[in-house]
């Protein structure tokens, strides 16, 4: 039975040209995290495998930095980066857990972080 929950940074906003950290945290399970995949709608941003290291998709290589930890730093933000991001935790023996983050990239300097929330 899958007992874990993913805690994410929830709905976040950031300024155009700035950077943002996408972060998820898996709790309430003793399952071993073997890999975390980061995706944006229909494309892969990055994979962090505990043993094989990081894979950064070529379309994001210039502006995605691994970390901190299992998270991902997205740099040089554009309005086109607005949308849903997913962290997919591959675990043993539970299977996969998915968290969702919605990022809004704003033209103005008024960019506030949303509240943290949980997805079962």
């Amino acid at each position: 039975m899958m007992t874990g929950t993913i805690e994410t940074t929830g709905n976040i906003s950031a300024e155009k040209g700035g950077s943002i950290i996408l972060q998820c945290h898996l709790s309430s399970t003793t399952a071993q995290v073997t890999q975390v995949n980061w995706e944006q709608q229909d494309q892969l941003l990055a994979i962090c495998n505990a043993d094989l290291g990081w894979h950064i998709s070529p379309s994001f290589k210039d502006r995605v930095a691994p970390g901190p930890g299992l998270g991902l730093t997205l740099q040089s933000l554009t309005v086109n980066d607005t949308g849903e991001y997913f962290c997919i935790y591959h675990t043993y023996p539970d299977g996969t857990y998915t968290g969702r983050i919605f990022l809004e990239v704003l033209e103005s300097s008024v960019a506030e972080h949303g509240a943290r929330f949980q997805i079962p």
């Epitope: 995949n37 994979i47 043993d51 990081w54 290589k61």
Partner: antibody, heavy 119, light 107 residues
């Protein structure tokens, strides 16, 4: 230029073990993950596992149920794959392959090592 | 494990033909797909990755596309040196898995 040079062909009896080496040159050995892929006659390629030469962490294909051990000697820029409890269906060409820096695509491959398991 | 299924398993074509090979994953693999070319007795060579980027030195007649579960490798105008076996591979999750291969033969 990047080169991966593997050890020579081996003939083994069922139940024995084989250890294949892969000597890397032309790049910084500890920066790229090394993988082992095998191909039985007329069959598809099969990923056996990979090792991060920097910290030694490795991920193996559970299909092999602990029969595969992947190691490395950073001072010799060499990766090793040992397969134990050999059976006839392990007869295959075994390749080492390097994946790119922060990229999982396997961009350079060794020449292959034929391992024949026969009584 | 994720299964990768290629079609067709083999095809016969002439020099100058447009050739399309498809690869279907048994579950979502996003864009974590790579294509390799292999000639008899030789190691595979990286062709296309992620899944539409040509590897260094690969001719522009090779192209790749797809996302999710369905992927395509296209050779726009087949050349004599392109007769080989082509494999797709996913690295979305371990164990990494390959398709069964598509052998491109001379008609």
């Amino acid at each position: 230029q990047v080169q991966l040079v593997q050890s020579g062909a081996e003939v083994k009896k069922p139940g024995a073990s084989v250890k294949v080496s892969c000597k890397a040159s032309g790049y910084t050995f500890t920066e790229n993950t090394m993988h082992w892929v095998r191909q039985a006659p007329g069959q598809r390629l099969e990923w056996m596992g990979g090792i991060n030469p920097n910290q030694g962490g490795n991920r193996n294909n559970q299909k092999f149920k602990g029969r595969v051990t992947i190691t490395r000697d950073t001072s010799a820029s060499t990766a090793y794959m040992e397969l134990s409890s050999l059976r006839s269906e392990d007869t295959a060409v075994y390749y080492c392959a390097r994946s790119g820096l922060r990229d999982y695509a396997m961009d350079y491959w060794g020449q292959g090592t034929l391992v024949t398991v026969s009584s | 494990d994720i299964q990768m299924t290629q079609s067709p398993s083999s095809l016969s074509a002439s020099v100058g033909d447009r050739v399309t090979i498809t690869c279907k994953a048994s579950q979502h693999v996003s864009t974590a797909v790579v294509w390799y070319q292999q000639k008899p007795g030789k190691a595979p060579k990286l062709l296309i990755y992620s899944p539409s980027y040509r590897y260094t030195g690969v001719p522009s007649r090779f192209s790749g596309s797809g996302s999710g579960t369905d992927f395509t490798l296209t050779i726009s105008s087949l050349q004599p040196e392109d007769f080989a076996t082509y494999y797709c591979q996913q690295h979305y999750s371990t164990p990494w898995t390959f398709g069964q291969g598509t052998k491109v033969e001379i008609k």
